[in-house]
């Protein structure tokens, strides 16, 4: 079971449902972006491979005071089996490349849509 209860979903949901909702939240962010997302904050780029949910969370958790991505941060924590805190980094980070949060979200969204289309939900 994918347990995302307590912050966004009403309880445990299938992995495909959780991924669908994460995609929609990222679509929401990209559609509703007026001013620069999170004041143009920069985050570490990540390798979009296995373990990318934790890596994405590790990268985004370092952005504070940005309400636009708070729901995304909470949703990503449902996909990551371990607790993530600010300043934590995994080998999945491309540690020499920082990109704007807006670009990070777009890249992540494109990749998640591809996974969803291909039926890779876990």
């Amino acid at each position: 079971l994918t347990c995302l209860g307590g912050f966004a979903s009403p309880g445990p949901v299938p992995p495909s449902t959780a991924l669908r909702e994460l995609i929609e939240e990222l679509v929401n962010i990209t559609q509703n972006q007026k001013a620069p997302l999170c004041n143009g904050s920069m985050v570490w780029s990540i390798n979009l491979t296995a373990g990318m949910y934790c890596a994405a969370l590790e990268s985004l958790i370092n952005v504070s005071g940005c309400s636009a991505i708070e729901k995304t941060q909470r949703m990503l924590s449902g996909f990551c089996p371990h607790k993530v805190s600010a300043g934590q980094f995994s080998s999945l980070h491309v540690r020499d490349t920082k990109i704007e949060v807006a670009q990070f979200v777009k890249d992540l969204l494109l990749h998640l849509k591809k996974l969803f289309r291909e039926g890779q939900f876990n």
Epitope: L1, A8, S9, P10, V13, P14, P15, S16, T17, R20, E21, I23, E24, V27, N28, Q31, F116, G119, F121
Partner: antibody
Framework: EVQLQESGPGLAKPSQTLSLTCSVT????????WNWIRKFPGNKLEYMGY???????YYNPSLKSQISITRDTSKNQLYLQLKSATTEDTATYYC????????????WGTGTTVTVSS | DIQMNQSPSSLSASLGDTITITCHAS??????LSWYQQKPGSLPKLLIY???DLHTGVPSRFSGSGSGTGFTLTISSLQPEDIATYYC?????????FGGGTKLEIK
């Protein structure tokens, strides 16, 4: 009360594009997920795809090159287009709602029957 | 895609009987299974979701059970209004898939 009502051509010729409409009343299509499902003669049900509250779409990979789901939020309607219809597309077409964070269809339309024949 | 095999394809029973319909998934779907009822000439209606949770307004004579790959829908004390075709559906992964249906008739 949420109601879904499908409409379509009834009869179509092979190679034509089928265009179907689902009119939603009592609820805004800018919430939740709006799906198309069809039932073939013999009762087999096939999931076709959805358009989300954001306008994002998903299509069953078996239909991907043939199908398009769009919407008009001002009319509270969703649309299904099926390109290059064949006799195999003869079916009753349903639209159905799926709420956020769920994976089951809680409200269905009455369905519209489409026969593809030369 | 996950295949859903439903049996029997048709069933004849007497009023007051208890009947069981089974659905088998080609892979583990946990409890992400729902059941629908479609009466002749009408639209499908959700009966049960999450394998055993009754949808709002559904009579308690309907019940569901199972997890993993095997599921059952049970109708106890069969009523005339239960004449319908019943379908299962998996929600584990996209594309969602349905069982072939079970047509229930009264003897």
């Amino acid at each position: 009360e949420v109601q879904l009502q499908e409409s379509g051509p009834g009869l179509a010729k092979p190679s034509q594009t089928l265009s179907l409409t689902c009119s939603v009343t009592g609820y805004s299509i800018t919430s939740d997920y709006w799906n198309w499902i069809r039932k073939f003669p013999g009762n087999k049900l096939e999931y076709m795809g959805y358009i989300s509250y954001n306008g994002n779409t998903y299509y069953n990979p078996s239909l991907k090159s043939q199908i398009s789901i769009t919407r008009d939020t001002s009319k509270n309607q969703l649309y299904l287009q099926l390109k290059s219809a064949t006799t195999e597309d003869t079916a009753t077409y349903y639209c159905a709602r799926l709420a956020k964070w769920t994976w089951y269809f809680d409200i269905w339309g009455t369905g519209t029957t489409v026969t593809v024949s030369s | 895609d996950i295949q859903m095999n439903q049996s029997p394809s048709s069933l004849s029973a007497s009023l007051g009987d208890t009947i069981t319909i089974t659905c088998h998934a080609s892979q583990n779907i946990n409890v992400w299974l729902s059941w629908y009822q479609q009466k002749p000439g009408s639209l499908p209606k959700l009966l049960i979701y999450k394998a055993s949770d009754l949808h709002t307004g559904v009579p308690s004579r309907f019940s569901g059970s199972g997890s993993g790959t095997g599921f059952t829908l049970t109708i106890s004390s069969l009523q005339p209004e239960d004449i319908a075709t019943y379908y299962c559906q998996q929600g584990q992964s996209y594309p969602y898939t349905f069982g072939g249906g079970t047509k229930l008739e009264i003897k």
